[in-house]
Interface confidence: medium
């Protein structure tokens, strides 16, 4: 997260760290007791590594009573996700067992009504991604409030040049932005999950390259079919 600040500890009980061989790889969001939603591209190069999900964490390294690392039973990428596009960049991870819920671990309701979030709406994005252009990784969860950007502006030739379909949304990126390592994490508007940080290699913090988020409402049928 660029231009953000340390989050209040455990105030986002839905927040997950998707880990590869014990190291943070991507963000994720607990959407059901046994399921975490993330970005498909996150596991593109996971190869033969061990993928796990950390829940109930604020610090990645320090012991915390609520922290628990879960093995992943099953990884389900969206059927149309492909390494060379930002479209359909969603992944559902089934935990090896139901998460132990509590004040620091709780699923987040996700948007089912397929309507665009109003431009200018302030939404919260959180993650353990890099906090500066030098690539410094934080130990504790960071967050930032970002205004939603209208699709027409985001699709300008100087911005994302028509790449933002109706299944994607944008948020402003003027010095405050999601960045590498935040992919798969939640964009939360009014206490509801609206978007998932896409995992392209986009430049961060440049106002002409807004943050791109996958609209979960557009994938309600797929999410329901996997969770069923």
């Amino acid at each position: 997260i660029l231009g953000g600040r340390e989050a209040e500890a455990h105030a986002r009980p839905y927040m997950a760290s998707v880990q590869l061989n014990g190291a943070h790889l991507c963000g994720g969001v607990l959407v059901a007791e046994q399921w975490v939603l993330s970005a498909a591209h996150c596991l593109e190069d996971a190869a033969d590594g061990k993928v796990q999900v950390l829940l109930g964490a604020h610090s990645l390294s320090q012991p915390e009573p609520s922290k628990r690392l879960y093995d992943v039973l099953r990884a389900v990428p969206h059927p149309d996700s492909q390494p060379d596009t930002i479209d359909h960049d969603l992944l559902l991870l089934q935990l090896s067992e139901k998460a132990t819920l509590g004040p620091a671990v709780r699923p987040l309701p996700w948007q089912r009504v397929d309507r665009d979030v109003a431009p200018g709406t302030l939404c919260d994005v959180a993650g353990w991604g890099i906090v500066n252009h030098a690539g410094r990784r934080p130990d504790s969860l960071q967050h930032v409030l970002l205004p939603v950007l209208d699709r027409a502006t985001c699709n300008r030739r100087t911005h994302h040049d028509g790449a933002i379909t109706e299944r994607l949304m944008c948020a402003e990126s003027n010095r405050r932005d999601s960045c590498k390592g935040d992919s798969g994490g939640p964009l939360v508007c009014g206490g509801v999950l609206e978007g998932v940080v896409t995992s392209g290699s986009r430049v961060c913090g440049n106002r002409k390259k807004p943050g791109i988020y996958t609209r979960v409402a557009s994938y309600a049928a797929w999410i329901d079919s996997v969770l069923a």
Epitope: N21, L43, E44, D45, A46, A47, D48, G49, K50, V51, L73, R74, A75, V76, P77, P79, Q94
Partner: antibody, heavy 120, light 112 residues
Framework: AVQLVESGGGLVQPKGSLKLSCAAS????????MNWVRQAPGKGLEWVAR??????????YYADSVKDRFTLSRDDSESMLYLQMNNLKTEDTAMYYC???????????WGTGTTVTVSS | DVLMTQTPLSLPVSLGDQASISCRSS???????????LEWYLQKSGQSPKLLIY???NRFSGVPDRFRGSGSGTDFTLKISRVEAEDLGVYYC?????????FGSGTKLEIK
């Protein structure tokens, strides 16, 4: 570019031995499971063997037809995969492909193959 | 061992036609982790095979959306909505859920 190059094939007599090599480049070899797949002349594909990464204890798996005769190994420091083939039979005659296995267990990168001919 | 039975062995088509290839496994190929490791590969003459579909229905990078995989349990299908000249070759289904892994016998897609 991601590449797999097989070598070591050739003509060998029945009951003889041969060691195939596969040189990997363009990716983090040590993190991937690797496989050998073969194809007899004019026939279909047959999976031969699989070796997992260090994080999975280099676990190996073999097709029943080669078990106890073929040994799969890897050298992560050199990005090399090996298949030691002993007690070769005429039915082992085939093109042998070195294949990378992605996270979702699919075979996403194939070498061009090396030909093994077992004949007296 | 899991036997993968592919039909038909040969599929003559006209360019622009839809093609459908069936693959049936002798037992369920749902892995203990819940995934179904069913893939489809295309091997063109004189070339190494190439991955088309994984996890039953996921198209691999660069694979056109005219290729669609479907199925569950023991019955799987690959459909090509409008066959193009570059689609000709031998198609193999493959199961990676149970060791030993097994390929189908192949289906040759050729021009009528």
């Amino acid at each position: 570019a991601v590449q797999l190059v097989e070598s070591g094939g050739g003509l060998v007599q029945p009951k003889g031995s041969l060691k195939l090599s596969c040189a990997a480049s363009g990716f983090s070899f040590n993190t991937y499971a690797m496989n050998w797949v073969r194809q007899a002349p004019g026939k279909g594909l047959e999976w031969v063997a699989r070796i997992r990464s260090k994080s999975n204890n280099y676990a190996t798996y073999y097709a029943d037809s080669v078990k106890d005769r073929f040994t799969l190994s890897r050298d992560d420091s050199e990005s090399m995969l090996y298949l030691q083939m002993n007690n070769l039979k005429t039915e082992d005659t085939a093109m042998y492909y070195c294949v990378r296995q992605g996270f979702y267990w699919y075979f996403d990168v194939w070498g061009t193959g090396t030909t093994v001919t077992v004949s007296s | 061992d899991v036997l993968m039975t592919q039909t038909p062995l040969s599929l003559p088509v006209s360019l622009g036609d839809q093609a459908s290839i069936s693959c049936r496994s002798s037992q369920t190929i749902v892995h203990s982790n819940g995934n179904t490791y069913l893939e489809w590969y295309l091997q063109k003459s004189g070339q190494s095979p190439k991955l088309l579909i994984y996890n039953v229905s996921n198209r691999f990078s660069g694979v056109p959306d005219r290729f669609r995989g479907s199925g569950s349990g023991t019955d799987f299908t690959l459909k090509i909505s409008r066959v193009e000249a570059e689609d000709l070759g031998v198609y193999y289904c493959f199961q990676g859920s149970h060791v030993p892994y097994t390929f189908g016998s192949g289906t040759k897609l050729e021009i009528k």
